[in-house]
Amino acid sequence: QDPYVKEAENLKKYFNAGDPDVADNGTLFLDILRNWKEESDRKIMQSQIVSFYFKLFKNFKDDQRIQKSVETIKEDINVKFFNSNKKKRDDFEKLTNYSVTDSNVQRKAVHELIQVMAELSPAAKIGKRKRSQMFRGRRASQ
Amino acid sequence: QDPYVKEAENLKKYFNAGDPDVADNGTLFLDILRNWKEESDRKIMQSQIVSFYFKLFKNFKDDQRIQKSVETIKEDINVKFFNSNKKKRDDFEKLTNYSVTDSNVQRKAVHELIQVMAELSPAAKIGKRKRSQMFRGRRASQ
């Protein structure tokens, strides 16, 4: 059994998350994850889910009763989601920590917007794009 | 020229984001995006970047001077990043809107943690993967 399971059970006790009423009104994440089979789509959704858990854990980081559990789970997320790649994890954390109300951050974000947009579609690179047209007869967008 | 370019230039004026000092102290997003070539890694990072822009746009949604620009850019993100898939966009927005300080949300999140973790690695569900291939016979970005 993965070590995170025991620690997640500990968190369940701490948050009273084992109570039957917790399942009322559907799931937060599980139904959404079931909608997406394609790896890149799953990463879009999981990225938001992981950042949610990181924020949640940050809010409880000083609580000694669950500190070990939180650390174990974060470590397992690091292994499973970031493939133990510290640079990937660090870049991700940088992105999640930018303050949307900081005027310098706002200006930088708007300054970079055109280049960010140009890279958003999977077929952003010209060579790749031509190839994808051949295979798909896809939308004549443009 | 993509219509978003003109609207992004309009936003630059509004935020004074064309000033030379904006480039000081490195980039927010561009250097990070340059680090990641693999599609699934890019999606992890772009997911955070897109949610940042959505939050930024939300904060300025009532400003008439940039409303058209913001809506054009959001539409283009919808086309490029979500492949005009409303369900993908809706699921993404649900995830970004969960409040990490709401105790009911916290309990649900902890309740779902074990199952979320089990699905985090790309090869989490071999059986499911095989089955999803049956329905696809293609590389489709669903």
Epitope: R139, S141 | K86, K87, R138, A140, S141, Q142
Partner: antibody
């Protein structure tokens, strides 16, 4: 009240052209994507083309082989479909339908509103 | 081709329940919204279910939509059948190139 009114249909010879129009009212046209759908006599619904509201992304059914062109004029609250090299298989009622707000501001529902349709007959 | 396959026709007596299936041939049913339309003879298509399960205002709660990922299909269920339910019903979804796809339609006859 949302209204979509198609016009421009009629009888045309094979190889000919037609331009269909769809006049929209009762909603902020410039915020919504729009669609054309057709229905041949006694047959099912067939999607023809779609266009986003602000970014001019255009989508076409593969079967059209580049013969049709969708466009819109947000100042006139109108959607158009330019149809060239028409064949008898293009004979159908052509419906205009409202899409959703692809910026997500006030999303709406795809295909919630349809016009009454305009009949295009291709015959020699 | 991203076909959506529907039965050609279904029939049932008033008061009974019918289910019309819509099976996706390629792609994953849950990854795109499914809509259902009712079209009476000579009429314009009218949306009766949107976004998989949602009902527009004015559509009776006898009509419901669902998704079944195990069969990669969507279903439209009409309970307490009435004569005015007699019509053609079409499912509709999307493919990965943002093309709209319609099912072939199902003719519902109320006996």
């Amino acid at each position: 009240e949302v209204q979509l009114v198609e016009s421009g249909g009629g009888l045309v010879k094979p190889g000919g052209s037609l331009r269909l129009s769809c006049a929209a009212s009762g909603f902020p046209f410039s915020r919504y994507s729009m669609h054309w759908v057709r229905q041949a006599p006694g047959k099912g619904l067939e999607w023809v083309s779609s266009m986003t509201s602000r970014t001019n992304h255009k989508y076409y059914a593969d079967s059209l082989k580049g013969r049709f062109l969708i466009s819109r004029d947000n100042d006139r609250d109108s959607l158009y479909l330019e149809m060239n090299s028409l064949g008898v298989e293009d004979t159908a009622i052509y419906f205009c339908a409202r899409g959703y707000d692809t910026s997500g501001s006030d999303s709406g529902v795809d295909f919630q509103y349809w016009g009454q349709g305009t009949l295009v007959t291709v015959s020699s | 081709n991203f076909m959506l396959t529907q039965p050609h026709s279904v029939s049932e007596s008033p008061g009974k329940t019918i289910t019309i299936s819509c099976t996706r041939g390629r792609g994953y049913i849950a990854s795109y919204y499914v809509q259902w339309y009712q079209q009476r003879p000579g009429g314009v298509p009218k949306i009766v279910v949107f976004e998989d399960t949602q009902r527009p205002s004015g559509v009776p709660d006898r009509i419901s939509g669902s998704i079944d990922t195990s069969t990669n299909s969507a279903s439209l269920t009409i309970s307490g059948l009435q004569t005015e339910d007699e019509a053609d019903y079409y499912c509709q979804s999307y493919d990965d190139a943002n093309h709209v796809i319609f099912g072939g339609g199902t003719k519902l006859t109320v006996l």
